[in-house]
C-alpha cells in the first residue's frame, strides 16, 4: 500500500518516463536539410513529456538509453518518382553539442516512398537530435505518414 | 527490501504494463478492409496482457501513451506484383468510439512486399484499433511475417 | 522519499531493465548465413546490459516479454542490385536451445536495400537469438545502417 501511495505521489518525470512524439512542421531553407518538428496536444496526437523542442529540433533532458523511432513518407510519390530522385536519404543524428555529433540512424528510399525504423541509443541531457532529409522530394506533413519520437528506456 | 517485497506483491497490471502481440487470423469479407487478429499462448507466440480482442480488433483497457507497431507482408508477392497492384495501403487507426476515430499510422507497399513501422500515441480505455488493408493482395498469415502489437509506455 | 531512496539502492538489473543494442561485427563463413554481432561502449554506441554475446549471437539472461528490433542495410546496393539478387531475406529467430527454435521475424529486401522492423515476443533465460541473412549481398557494417537490439518490456 505504501508503495502504491508513494508511486502516485512521485511526479512521473522522476520515474524517468521521458517521451516525445512529434509531427512535421516544415522543411528547412534550401541549404538546410533538416526537418523541423512540432508537438503538443493542440496539434493533435503529438506530445513532449520531458524532452523539449529547440527551433524545431528535439533536445533531450534526461540521460539514459532511448528508443528513437521515425517514419517519413515522401509527398506525391510513386516508386518511379522515388527511384528517379535517388538518392533520397534520411539520417537521424545528434547534431549538438558538436563534440557529440554522430549519425544514429540512416535509410535511403530507393524505390519506396516511406522509410520507417527504430533503434536503442544512449543519449545525454542537452543532446539535440536532428533529422536530415537529403534529396529533391518533399516529406508528407500528414501526421499518420511522417512522425518522429523518442522514449526513455533506462538509465 | 520493503520496496522489493511491495513490488513483488503488486499485480503487474497495476504497474500499467499492458501489452499485446497479435497474429493474423483472417481478412474481412469483400467490402471490409479490416484485418482480423488473434492472440494467445495456444496460438504460438502471441499474447494479450491487458488489452482485449473484440471481434478480431484490439481494444485498449488502460489510458496512456502506447507504442503501436505493425508488420504486414503480402502473400506470394514479388516487387512486380506489388507495383502492379499499387496502391496497396495499410492504415492503423482508432475506429471506435466514432468520436475518436483517427488514422494513426499509414504506409503504402509501392514496390515492396512488406511494410513495418511503429509509433507512440495516446490511447484511452475503450479505444478500438483497426488495421485496414486496401488493395487486391492477401496478407501473409505466417506469424513471423505479419503481426500487430501495442505496449503501454507511460500514463 | 523512502521510495525514491529504495529505488536508487536497487541495482537496475533487479528491475528487469535488460537491454542490448549491437552492431555488426562480421558475416559467417560461406555455409553459415548468420550475422555476427558485437557490442560495448569501446565500439561506439552499442551496449549490453543484461543479455550477453555468445560467439557473436545474443543470449538472453532474463525471462520476459522483449521488444526485438533490427535494421539491416545491404552494402553497395541499388534497387537494381537488390532486385537482381532477390530473394535476399533476413530472419531473426531463436536458434538455441534447439527445442525452442523458431523464426520470430522475417523480411525480404525485394527492390529495397534496407529492411527494418520490430516485434514483441516472449523470451526465456538461455534463449539465443540468431539473425540469418540469406542471399549473395553483404550487409553494411556502418553502425547507423545495420544494428540489432532487444529491450525487456515486462515479465
Amino acid at each position: 500500500q505504501r508503495f502504491a501511495q508513494a508511486q502516485q505521489q512521485l511526479p512521473l518525470e522522476s520515474l524517468g518516463w521521458d517521451v516525445a512524439e512529434l509531427q512535421l512542421n516544415h522543411t528547412g531553407p534550401q541549404q538546410d536539410p533538416r526537418l523541423y518538428w512540432q508537438g503538443g496536444p493542440a496539434l493533435g496526437r503529438s506530445f513532449l513529456h520531458g524532452p523539449e523542442l529547440d527551433k524545431g529540433q528535439l533536445r533531450i533532458h534526461r540521460d539514459g538509453i532511448y528508443m528513437v523511432h521515425i517514419q517519413v513518407t515522401l509527398a506525391i510519390c510513386s516508386s518511379t518518382t522515388a527511384s528517379r530522385h535517388h538518392p533520397t536519404t534520411l539520417a537521424v543524428g545528434i547534431c549538438s553539442p558538436a563534440s557529440r555529433s554522430i549519425s544514429l540512424l540512416r535509410l535511403s528510399f530507393h524505390q519506396g516512398c516511406t522509410i520507417a525504423s527504430q533503434r536503442l541509443t544512449p543519449l545525454a541531457r542537452g543532446d539535440t537530435l536532428c533529422t536530415n532529409l537529403t534529396g529533391t522530394l518533399l516529406p508528407s506533413r500528414n501526421t499518420d505518414e511522417t512522425f518522429f519520437g523518442v522514449q526513455w528506456v533506462r538509465p | 527490501q520493503r520496496f522489493a517485497q511491495a513490488q513483488q506483491q503488486l499485480p503487474l497490471e497495476s504497474l500499467g504494463w499492458d501489452v499485446a502481440e497479435l497474429q493474423l487470423n483472417h481478412t474481412g469479407p469483400q467490402q471490409d478492409p479490416r484485418l482480423y487478429w488473434q492472440g494467445g499462448p495456444a496460438l504460438g507466440r502471441s499474447f494479450l496482457h491487458g488489452p482485449e480482442l473484440d471481434k478480431g480488433q484490439l481494444r485498449i483497457h488502460r489510458d496512456g501513451i502506447y507504442m503501436v507497431h505493425i508488420q504486414v507482408t503480402l502473400a506470394i508477392c514479388s516487387s512486380t506484383t506489388a507495383s502492379r497492384h499499387h496502391p496497396t495501403t495499410l492504415a492503423v487507426g482508432i475506429c471506435s468510439p466514432a468520436s475518436r476515430s483517427i488514422s494513426l499510422l499509414r504506409l503504402s507497399f509501392h514496390q515492396g512486399c512488406t511494410i513495418a513501422s511503429q509509433r507512440l500515441t495516446p490511447l484511452a480505455r475503450g479505444d478500438t484499433l483497426c488495421t485496414n488493408l486496401t488493395g487486391t493482395l492477401l496478407p501473409s498469415r505466417n506469424t513471423d511475417e505479419t503481426f500487430f502489437g501495442v505496449q503501454w509506455v507511460r500514463p | 522519499q523512502r521510495f525514491a531512496q529504495a529505488q536508487q539502492q536497487l541495482p537496475l538489473e533487479s528491475l528487469g531493465w535488460d537491454v542490448a543494442e549491437l552492431q555488426l561485427n562480421h558475416t559467417g563463413p560461406q555455409q553459415d548465413p548468420r550475422l555476427y554481432w558485437q557490442g560495448g561502449p569501446a565500439l561506439g554506441r552499442s551496449f549490453l546490459h543484461g543479455p550477453e554475446l555468445d560467439k557473436g549471437q545474443l543470449r538472453i539472461h532474463r525471462d520476459g516479454i522483449y521488444m526485438v528490433h533490427i535494421q539491416v542495410t545491404l552494402a553497395i546496393c541499388s534497387s537494381t542490385t537488390a532486385s537482381r539478387h532477390h530473394p535476399t531475406t533476413l530472419a531473426v529467430g531463436i536458434c538455441s536451445p534447439a527445442s525452442r527454435s523458431i523464426s520470430l521475424l522475417r523480411l525480404s529486401f525485394h527492390q529495397g536495400c534496407t529492411i527494418a522492423s520490430q516485434r514483441l515476443t516472449p523470451l526465456a533465460r538461455g534463449d539465443t537469438l540468431c539473425t540469418n541473412l540469406t542471399g549473395t549481398l553483404l550487409p553494411s557494417r556502418n553502425t547507423d545502417e545495420t544494428f540489432f537490439g532487444v529491450q525487456w518490456v515486462r515479465p
Partner: antibody
Framework: QVQLKQSGAELVKPGASVKMSCKAS????????MHWLKQTPGQGLEWIGA????????SYNQNFKGKATLTADKSSSTAYMQLNSLTSEDSAVYYC?????????????WGQGTLVTVSA | DIVMTQSPASLDVSLGQRATISCRAS??????????MHWYQQKPGQPPKLLIS???NLESGVPARFSGSGSGTDFTLTIYPVEEEDAATYYC?????????FGSGTKLEIK
C-alpha cells in the same frame, strides 16, 4: 456483380489466326488480371496466360508462348486473345476469367466461353 | 509445373450420401499461411463455377453441404448430403505459382 461477355464461336482454317474478345462490366477492369483458359475433352482445363490491363503486362504458360497473344483496351474494358498458326489441336472452348476480390489466379468470374473449331 | 492428380475419375453416389473427391499436388501448394487450392463444379455447356477457394473457404451462394479440407499436398472436397443437382464434373486447381494447373476432373453421378 462483374460479368464477362465473350465473342461468338469461330470456325477457322488450319494455319489461320483468330482473335476473340472478353468485355468486362464494372469499373475494376484495370485492377485485376484477366486470365485465359483452354478446355478440351482430352487435355481438360489449361491456363494460357494473363494480362494486367492497368499496364498491359502479360504472363504466359510456356506451352502457349508463341501461340497466344494477350492484349487489353482499358477504355472499353475489353481483353483480347489472338491465337495464330491454328491446328486441329487448337480446337477448344476458350474462357476468360478473373478473381472477384483478391488478384490471385483462382477464378470467381468466367465468360461463357468461345468455341473455336479448326477445320479445313 | 505442379501436377494435380485427382481421384477418382468418376464417382457414383446415392442421394443423401457422402461424396469425397481427392486431389494431390506434386509439391506443396501452401504458402504464407494459406493453401492455394480451389475447387470448381462444371455442368455441360457451362463454364466452371468456383465452389471453394483457399482449400476451405466456401464461396458466396454455395450450399453448406460442400466443404473443403487439406493442406500442403493433399486436399479433399466433400459433398454431404449429395443432392440431384450436384451431378457434374469437379476440378481442383492450385494457384501457388505460375502456371496454375487443374486436376483432370471427377465426374459425379447420382444413383
Amino acid at each position: 456483380q462483374v460479368q464477362l461477355k465473350q465473342s461468338g464461336a469461330e470456325l477457322v482454317k488450319p494455319g489461320a489466326s483468330v482473335k476473340m474478345s472478353c468485355k468486362a462490366s464494372g469499373d475494376t477492369f484495370p485492377r485485376y488480371n484477366m486470365h485465359w483458359l483452354k478446355q478440351t475433352p482430352g487435355q481438360g482445363l489449361e491456363w494460357i496466360g494473363a494480362i494486367f490491363p492497368g499496364n498491359g503486362e502479360t504472363s504466359y504458360n510456356q506451352n502457349f508462348k508463341g501461340k497466344a497473344t494477350l492484349t487489353a483496351d482499358k477504355s472499353s474494358s475489353t481483353a483480347y486473345m489472338q491465337l495464330n498458326s491454328l491446328t486441329s489441336e487448337d480446337s477448344a472452348v476458350y474462357y476468360c476469367a478473373r478473381n472477384s476480390y483478391y488478384d490471385y489466379a483462382w477464378f470467381t468470374y468466367w465468360g461463357q466461353g468461345t468455341l473455336v473449331t479448326v477445320s479445313a | 509445373d505442379i501436377v494435380m492428380t485427382q481421384s477418382p475419375a468418376s464417382l457414383d453416389v446415392s442421394l443423401g450420401q457422402r461424396a469425397t473427391i481427392s486431389c494431390r499436388a506434386s509439391k506443396s501448394v501452401s504458402s504464407s499461411g494459406y493453401s492455394f487450392m480451389h475447387w470448381y463444379q462444371q455442368k455441360p455447356g457451362q463454364p466452371p463455377k468456383l465452389l471453394i477457394s483457399l482449400a476451405s473457404n466456401l464461396e458466396s451462394g454455395v450450399p453448406a453441404r460442400f466443404s473443403g479440407s487439406g493442406s500442403g499436398t493433399d486436399f479433399t472436397l466433400t459433398i454431404y448430403p449429395v443432392e440431384e443437382e450436384d451431378a457434374a464434373t469437379y476440378y481442383c486447381q492450385h494457384s501457388r505459382e505460375f502456371p496454375p494447373t487443374f486436376g483432370s476432373g471427377t465426374k459425379l453421378e447420382i444413383k
